[in-house]
């Protein structure tokens, strides 16, 4: 069945922690992605940004998780109003920012 929101959030946090702790060389060869507004529709917005990174084994599981948690189909090159379209950041920074926000949501019990 569908993954409960609290479980989904916890699993995603664990995976992002794993990425940040195991990072040796520049994550995804220093690829840049659009920054996002960490508000409503965050899973889809994060996927829309990270899906434009290809060939990066370190974030494949994160992409899978976000794809499963986002209720609509997302393709590379697709953008929504949830992106801060004038700001690109490294994937490593994107992951750190997302992790901090997700941890905050988890502490506050905001699972959806």
């Amino acid at each position: 069945g569908p993954v409960p929101p609290s479980t989904a959030l916890r699993e995603l946090i664990e995976e992002l922690v794993n990425i940040t702790q195991n990072q040796k060389a520049p994550l995804c060869n220093g690829s840049m992605v659009w920054s996002i507004n960490l508000t409503a529709g965050m899973y889809c917005a994060a996927l829309e940004s990270l899906i434009n990174v290809s060939g990066c084994s370190a974030i494949e599981k994160t992409q899978r998780m976000l794809s499963g948690f986002c209720p609509h189909k997302v393709s590379a090159g697709q953008f929504s109003s949830l992106h801060v379209r004038d700001t690109k950041i490294e994937v490593a920074q994107f992951v750190k920012d997302l992790l901090l926000h997700l941890k905050k949501l988890f502490r506050e019990g905001q699972f959806n």
Partner: antibody, heavy 118, light 111 residues
Framework: EVQLKESGPGLVAPGGSLSITCTVS????????INWVRQPPGKGLEWLGM???????DYADALKSRLSISKDSSKSQVFLEMTSLRTDDTATYYC????????????WGQGTSVTVSS | DIVLTQSPASLAVSLGQRATISCRAS??????????MHWYQQKAGQPPKLLIY???NLESGVPARFSGSGSRTDFTLTIDPVQAEDAATYYC?????????FGGGTKLEIK
């Protein structure tokens, strides 16, 4: 335009080694993954292994001990090396690029034919 | 490794009729709500061509007569109506685990 082209020796002796190069254009090997797939004459496709854009390498379990995949991103080349060749390694060898997530193989080379025979 | 078994090994379908090809996986290829199963078409003397990804999504430029369905271990590729240019061998492929695998292929002949 995305293109992949394999180049190999054509004929290899049993017990020998095989080296195939995949030269790509239209995209960068630093942010795309390349798969190696082979097809014996009249038979189906067999996935051999892949090298990710970030350098991770995955191999098919059955061939792991005989295979080596590497790349030179600056030259846009990916290399497949196979040791201890047998006659049943005779096949057309393809390189294929992974697209974006979910990483299906969206562009393929035309393949290079390799015959293992004395 | 996940073993993919395709059936039938070959089939002949009349022009304009429906062709159905099955692919069964030895274990689930589902992960976080998606099925990591893809379908390829290979015509004689050519490399394979991606048709469908994630079980049911049509690759850009592929005609709408091709469709895919299924989840977990059972998947189907449907061509309806079959055209003369669809004569080819069709392969399923999974990438739910690090070691990817292909099915044995199904050869489609048009009557």
């Amino acid at each position: 335009e995305v293109q992949l082209k394999e180049s190999g020796p054509g004929l290899v002796a049993p017990g020998g080694s095989l080296s195939i190069t995949c030269t790509v254009s239209g995209f960068s090997l630093t942010d795309s993954s390349i798969n190696w797939v082979r097809q014996p004459p009249g038979k189906g496709l067999e996935w051999l292994g892949m090298i990710w854009g970030d350098g991770r390498i995955d191999y098919a379990d059955a061939l792991k001990s005989r295979l080596s995949i590497s790349k030179d991103s600056s030259k846009s080349q990916v290399f497949l090396e196979m040791t201890s060749l047998r006659t049943d390694d005779t096949a057309t060898y393809y390189c294929a690029r992974d697209g974006y997530f979910p990483y299906a193989m969206d562009f393929w080379g035309q393949g290079t034919s390799v015959t293992v025979s004395s | 490794d996940i073993v993919l078994t395709q059936s039938p090994a070959s089939l002949a379908v009349s022009l304009g009729q429906r062709a159905t090809i099955s692919c069964r996986a030895s274990e689930s290829v589902d992960s976080y709500g998606n099925s990591y199963m893809h379908w390829y078409q290979q015509k004689a003397g050519q490399p394979p061509k991606l048709l469908i990804y994630l079980a049911s999504n049509l690759e850009s430029g592929v005609p709408a007569r091709f469709s895919g369905s299924g989840s977990r271990t059972d998947f189907t590729l449907t061509i309806d109506p079959v055209q003369a240019e669809d004569a080819a061998t069709y392969y399923c492929q999974q990438n739910n685990e690090d070691s990817r695998t292909f099915g044995g292929g199904t050869k489609l002949e048009i009557k």
